[in-house]
Structures are given as C-alpha cells and as structure tokens.
Interface confidence: low
C-alpha cells in the first residue's frame, strides 16, 4: 500500500521538515524559518509557537516539531501544551480572583497551585489524629483510640529485649 | 557582505575521518537552513546533507553518505560542520557549504535551492 501511495502521490516522499507545494509542481521546499512540519507528505508548514510574555521557552521550534512553552518563575502551566500560565501562590494558599488567600480552618494546600483540600477525617477510619493539620499540611491519622487503650492487643509482637549491657550483633 | 569560508579539508586514507568547518559572516546565521554539496572532477555538483535553520533533525542525507557523514551547526559560533568518517576513494570532492534561501520552488538537495555558496575545500581519499 505504501508503494503504491508514494507511485500515484509524491508529495508522499516530502519527509518532516518540508512541505509539497501543488503550486510548483509537488516539489518538496524545505519549511520556512519559524514553521515546521512534523509529518511527511504534508501540503504546508505550520507556524511556531512563540513563548511570549509569560511564557518561556521549554523546547525550541525544530522544522520538525513546535516550539514547547513551560512559564516564567511564579507561575505554572495549566491546560494542554501548557495553554495558559497561573500564578503561584504559597503552601498554605489558594488562587482566588482576589489573588492568592490563606486557606480556611480545616483545609489545606501543600503545594503552590491548586485548591486548598479538607482535612482528612481520621474518624471515618475509625482513627485518631495522631498529627493535628495546618494550612499547609494535612492531619496524620494514628491507631485507632481503641488500639491505644489498657489491654489491647498488638498487631506487632514486641521486641525481644536484650540483656543490660550487650550491644546489638 | 554575505561570506562563507570552508576550512578542515585535506588528504586521508580510506577508512578515515575529517571534520569539516564552514564559517558565516555577514549576515543572521540561525535564520536560514544549510547545506554541505561536493563537486568531484568532472562530475556535477552533488548533494550531501542539509540542516534546517535552528539545528533541527537532518531531513535531508544523501544514500551515498548515510551513516558516515554527519551535519550540524552552532549558531552561538556562526559555523555550520560535515564530520566525515569511513571515508572512501568515491569521497573525494571539493565540499561546499551553502545558504538556503528564505523560500525556494526547487527541490531542497538541488543546488538552486541555495544562494550564497562558500569557495569550497578539497577532499582527497587515497
């Protein structure tokens, strides 16, 4: 099939990095500075992306790949290919449209984007909190309160104990 | 003043290597695709390799060369580079160097395709 293709159709043997042009009798012209093509036997280049303003660039344009965008320091990439660049705010916050807010008591936000997250209710496990949580960092669910009272078994076996006055092998 | 000036030619044996230099001045280097032809007594002039502007994937190697000649560029130094290795008789050429143009209706390994020409270097395999 490919044989055939490339016999009836010659733009076909154009490879990444050129284009056909049907105007000047299917020859293969190499892509333009600033555009690329990322696939053989195509008809135009595409032009490159340009990382602008907030945007920086990650990857150059190649003749056969798109410029890749990443954002400046203070902000980061948010949709696909890095479509848009959000501030940054710190742990502990969330981006409203009033800018960046220290989270409510009960959530929090460990990193510097995203929303801040409820605690974790230890007691739905039927757990105790052995860490209580801030606005940057979550609860540390411990045993559960009926593990910690007199008598209760544990799931570990204890340690052999040693002897006073040897060290450990 | 658009100039460019091979250098790194020479006599080698076959099976060697020689790296070859084309220096660009003159004019924005890292805007315009080039290529590497040769010219081997009485023969036409014949493409090589090709590299687009900003030292993306080679699109372009001739079969003849294919696995022993390696293009590139360092647009920081304006030079463009043809390393040549397992060199054999059928190598021996004076090598150019050429700018390609903005935009071109030739195809890319034909030698119209190209504007400025350097005054090229001898390459002897024996």
């Known amino acids: 099939f490919e044989r055939t293709r490339s016999l009836q159709d010659p733009c076909s043997n154009c490879p990444a990095g050129t284009f056909c042009d049907n105007n000047r009798n299917q020859i293969c012209s190499p892509c333009p500075p600033n555009s690329f093509s990322s696939a053989g036997g195509q008809r135009t280049c595409d032009i490159c992306r340009q990382c602008k303003g907030v945007f920086r660039t990650r990857k150059e344009c190649s003749s056969t790949s798109n410029a890749e965008c990443d954002c400046t320091p203070g902000f980061h990439c948010l949709g696909a290919g890095c479509s848009m660049c959000e501030q940054d705010c710190k742990q502990g916050q969330e981006l409203t449209k009033k800018g960046c807010k220290d989270c409510c008591f009960g959530t929090f936000n460990d990193q510097k984007r995203g929303i801040c997250r409820p605690w974790t209710n230890c007691s739905l496990d039927g757990k105790s909190v052995l860490v209580n949580g801030t606005k940057e960092r979550d609860v540390v669910c411990g045993p559960s309160p009926a593990d910690l009272s007199p008598g209760a078994s544990s799931v570990t076996p204890p340690a052999p104990a040693r002897e006073p006055g040897h060290s450990p092998q | 003043e658009v100039q460019l000036l091979e250098s790194g030619g020479g006599e080698v044996q076959p099976g060697g290597s020689l790296r070859l230099s084309c220096a660009a001045s003159g004019w924005a280097f890292g805007n315009y695709g080039m290529a590497w032809f040769r010219q081997a007594p009485g023969k036409e002039r014949e493409f090589v390799s090709r590299l687009a502007w900003n030292g993306g994937s080679t699109d372009y190697v001739a079969e003849s060369v294919k696995g022993r000649f390696t293009i590139s560029r360092d647009n920081a130094k304006n030079t463009l580079y043809l390393q040549m290795s397992s060199l054999r008789a059928e190598d021996t050429a004076v090598y150019y160097c050429?700018?390609?143009?903005?935009?071109?209706?030739?195809?890319?390994?034909?030698?119209?395709?190209?504007?400025?020409w350097g005054q090229g270097t001898l390459v002897t395999v024996k």
């Open positions: 050429a700018r390609q143009r903005s935009y071109s209706r030739y195809d890319i390994r034909t030698p119209q395709t190209y504007d400025y």
